[in-house]
Interface confidence: low
């Protein structure tokens, strides 16, 4: 189920799967929610620790049991991922942090009149992930009203420093507020060039596009279909970026499909989940559990309810079925995508719906004259 | 909203505009999306206009002037007014609207979390009221959704300011001693939300007040936590399962 309570002055021991710098616990929680394996997180505010390297530290954690021992740590904040929390799942983070400088690669500097305008510039720049703004009262006059647009390899700051008269925040592209607009087109038999930022296996180009949309550095992608000539590259989804933000070249290539991240779409973003079920396909991965259920939809529901389950395969082989029920293989991987995709099998596969934000599986723990 | 500022897209994605289509179409009240098919609002919005057909509910919008004849809207399947609400009084000013068709959630249209039943222990320090209502007592409906940050006031303090009325434990008040910031006409039924531990919760429903933003006359809101049993009962009995965001 959905657990939203935060634990003050508590730190989860062990289970680390990733760490990064975030300005507050809520942003840390959001990163945990979108991380394929993170179930728990612990955050160390600047006030909670003297070690400069660990200040603003966000530690993403996994646990086979779904819980970890809590140790007392003054000022620390811990909590759960919001996977399975329905509409609360959002990559949108509007907060602006005063007195904080989020470090990264500064790729653009301009003078603006307010922090809101700086955030708007970041939101309207295809490469900007976060920004810092030096206010009118910044100690160095030449830097006053400077708006620094930034990015980093992981999409989070490479460091966060306490600095007076500086305000920082994140791009509002995940809030569907970008003025850039997006390319919805999918280009058949076309391969994009440029830098690969990640490689995952997906059953189709649409899953590839959604993964690209929620990857911090993916601007466009190329997907190699299951009939691509090189067997080892079949179902490969290459997430890509470039200096300019668009592909520098594209090559006509049979059995490839290319397209763009939808992060810059105005007013609507795809859900960060994949609801389609793929008949005759087997998703390989680490076995989490095997259970007998009646029908592929129940298998998907079972996967969705088991928070660590990322994807599943429902077998229809005679030896895997008893009466009306067949084996439902609940699986996971390091990156949330299948480690292998096989075709022509007796069964169907699909993904957990734990990150779908349309479910009702959500729990919130939110005069004389009428008006 | 008096003393407020313009909201931005998706800032209050649960806010809806309840509009009436008679000879003309006008915004009458606000409301809060609490589930795919449920809106929470004030009972007094339906006084004398309880017919479902005349109402149009707009969600996922910021600017009322963007609404055209082609703008999609929701229609009402059922209006559930609190059984103890009386036309001539301000008590139990709460109503549920069941929409004819469920809404999909987006960044601009998603529900607000409800408080826990009888939530009295949480100290809310960051509360906002939103709406398209008047920006002054003798004003007019605003085009862009307005927001204003208002502190909660204790019921004891509120009762002192409204000696002719009974401020019950099922009401919550908010306002500045000096006035200047408040809900106003047309904000009725809309949300008073508070952020706690990084999460927004629906603490109140805009109900009434003496004028708008007057000195020492706080706004009075229906306290949602006091009606959680009623909300759960109505939303569950309607179709067998809870269709709104229930508390932990």
């Amino acid at each position: 189920g959905c657990l939203t309570q935060l634990y003050e002055n508590a730190f989860f021991r062990g289970g680390d799967v990733a760490s990064m710098y975030t300005p507050n616990a809520q942003y840390c929680q959001m990163r945990c929610t979108f991380h394929p394996r993170c179930l728990l997180f612990s955050f160390l505010p600047a006030s909670s620790i003297n070690d400069m390297e660990k200040r603003f530290g966000c530690f993403l954690k996994d646990s086979v049991t779904g819980t970890l021992p809590k140790v007392h740590r003054t000022g620390a904040v811990s909590g759960h991922s919001l996977k399975q929390c329905g509409h609360q799942i959002s990559a949108c983070h509007r907060d602006i942090y005063k007195g904080v400088d989020m470090r990264g690669v500064n790729f653009n500097v301009s003078k603006v009149s307010s922090v809101e305008e700086c955030q708007k510039r970041c939101t309207s720049n295809i490469r900007c992930q976060f920004f810092s703004y030096a206010t009118q009262t910044f100690h160095k006059a030449e830097y006053r009203n400077n708006c620094l647009l930034k990015y980093s390899p992981g999409g989070t700051p490479t460091a966060i420093k306490v600095l007076s008269n500086v305000e920082s925040g994140f791009s509002l592209k995940p809030c569907a507020l970008s003025e850039i607009g997006c390319h919805m087109n999918i280009f058949q038999h076309l391969a994009f060039s440029d830098v690969d930022v990640a490689r995952v296996l997906t059953p189709d180009a649409f899953v590839c596009r959604t993964i690209c949309t929620y990857h911090p550095n993916c601007l466009f992608f190329t997907f190699y279909t299951n009939v691509w000539k090189i067997e080892s590259q079949r179902n490969v989804c290459l997430l890509k970026t470039s200096e300019s933000g668009t592909p520098s070249s594209s090559t006509p290539q049979e059995n490839t499909i290319s397209g763009y991240s939808l992060l810059t779409c105005k007013r609507t973003l795809p859900e960060p989940c994949h609801s389609k079920i793929y008949p005759g396909v087997d998703f390989g991965g680490e076995e989490l559990n095997v259970t007998f259920v009646k029908g592929v939809n129940v298998c998907q529901e079972t996967c969705t309810k088991m928070i660590r389950c990322q994807f599943f395969t429902y077998s229809l082989l005679p030896e895997d079925c008893k009466e009306e029920k067949c084996k439902c293989f609940l699986r996971l991987s390091m990156d949330g995508s299948p480690t292998r995709i096989a075709y022509g099998t007796q069964g169907s596969s699909g993904y957990s719906l734990r990150l779908c934000n349309t479910g009702d599986n959500s729990v919130c723990t939110t005069k004389t004259s009428t008006r | 909203i008096v003393g407020g500022t313009n909201s931005s897209w998706g800032e209050w994605p649960w806010q809806v505009s309840l509009q009436v289509k008679l000879t003309a179409q006008r915004h009458l009240c606000g409301g809060s999306l609490i589930g795919h098919q449920w809106v929470l609002t004030a009972a007094h919005c339906f006084d004398g206009l309880p017919l479902q057909d005349v109402w149009r509910i707009y969600s996922g919008i910021l600017n009322l002037s963007d609404i055209t004849k082609d703008t999609p809207f929701s229609q009402i399947k059922e209006i559930i007014i609190h059984q103890n609400y009386k036309v001539s009084e301000g008590n139990h000013d709460i109503a549920l609207i069941k929409l004819q068709a469920p809404l999909n959630y987006t960044e601009f249209q998603k529900p607000i979390c409800l408080p826990s039943k009888g939530d009295t222990s949480t100290i809310y320090t960051n509360c906002w009221v939103t709406g398209w209502g008047f920006s002054k007592e003798k004003g007019e409906i605003q085009n862009i959704l307005q927001k204003v940050n208002i502190p909660l006031v204790t019921n004891e303090e509120c009762q002192k300011r409204y000696q002719d009325y009974k401020i019950t434990q099922r009401m919550v008040c908010a306002g500045y001693k000096e006035g200047g910031k408040d809900a106003c006409k047309g904000d009725s039924g809309g949300p008073l939300v508070c952020k706690h531990n990084g999460m927004w919760r629906l603490v109140g429903i805009t109900s009434w007040g003496e004028g708008c933003a007057r000195r020492e006359q706080p706004g009075v809101y229906t306290k949602v936590a006091e009606y959680m049993d009623w909300i759960l009962e109505k939303t569950q009995s309607s179709d067998g399962k809870a269709q709104m965001q229930s508390p932990a």
Epitope: S369 | T23, G48, V87, E137, E140
Partner: antibody
Framework: EVQLLESGGGLVQPGGSLRLSCAAS????????MMWVRQAPGKGLEWVSG????????VYADSVKGRFTISRDNSKNTLYLQMNSLRAEDTAVYYC???????????????WGQGTMVTVSS | DIQMTQSPSTLSASVGDRVTITCRAS??????LAWYQQKPGKAPNLLIY???TLESGVPSRFSGSGSGTEFTLTISSLQPDDFATYYC????????FGQGTKVEIK
């Protein structure tokens, strides 16, 4: 004391126009939904038109739609009824009315003016 | 439009009588119904609203009941001051009055 005082009635020829006024006092006029109701001689009551407290919403009976216009000036505490294309069947006493609850709403009417007579005749 | 039908049109009664007037709506109006009393040359006077709620200052001998489409006004013991015309009014959708019931001395 709460009071509604209608004026502007009189004799008018068919097809003519007339503007009725209703001066309100003793209450916060701008908070309330106001109505016009008429009563033909020896006949029953007929609701004519209503206006929301801000003036934003106006509603009319089918019998007067397109001919009558209700309006209000909250700064003057006055309600108006502009009557055009008058017919013999519009002959009636015209009352303005409202509901004196602390809450503006579409409702029954508990406060009525004394009425003003409109006669449409050639 | 919602039509309101009152019966009877005229009712002859004596002081002390129990008097009942009925009002039927052409479609359901929930409890959004009011009753008025009107005397010749005077404006109507609200007696009951929301079908059964007695308006402040109205004698308790007046009572209202019903919901949906069928409504009743009852005067438990008719007084000399009660001889007048009574109107029902729906305010569910816009406003419609019944045609009136005249209560006269028998």
């Amino acid at each position: 004391e709460v009071q509604l005082l209608e004026s502007g009635g009189g004799l008018v020829q068919p097809g003519g126009s007339l503007r009725l006024s209703c001066a309100a006092s003793g209450f916060t006029f701008s908070h309330y939904i106001m109505m016009w109701v008429r009563q033909a001689p020896g006949k029953g009551l007929e609701w004519v038109s209503g206006i929301y407290s801000s003036g934003g919403i106006t509603v009319y009976a089918d019998s007067v739609k397109g001919r009558f216009t209700i309006s209000r000036d909250n700064s003057k505490n006055t309600l108006y009824l502009q009557m055009n294309s008058l017919r013999a069947e519009d002959t009636a006493v015209y009352y303005c009315a409202y509901r004196r609850t602390g809450i503006p709403r579409w409702d029954a009417f508990d406060i009525w003016g004394q009425g003003t007579m409109v006669t449409v005749s050639s | 439009d919602i039509q309101m039908t009152q019966s009877p049109s005229t009712l002859s009664a004596s002081v002390g009588d129990r008097v009942t007037i009925t009002c039927r709506a052409s479609q359901s109006i929930s409890s959004w119904l009011a009753w008025y009393q009107q005397k010749p040359g005077k404006a109507p006077n609200l007696l009951i609203y929301k079908a059964s709620t007695l308006e402040s200052g109205v004698p308790s001998r007046f009572s209202g009941s019903g919901s949906g489409t069928e409504f009743t006004l009852t005067i438990s013991s008719l007084q000399p001051d009660d001889f007048a015309t009574y109107y029902c009014q729906q305010y569910n959708t816009y406003w419609t009055f019944g045609q009136g019931t005249k209560v006269e001395i028998k």
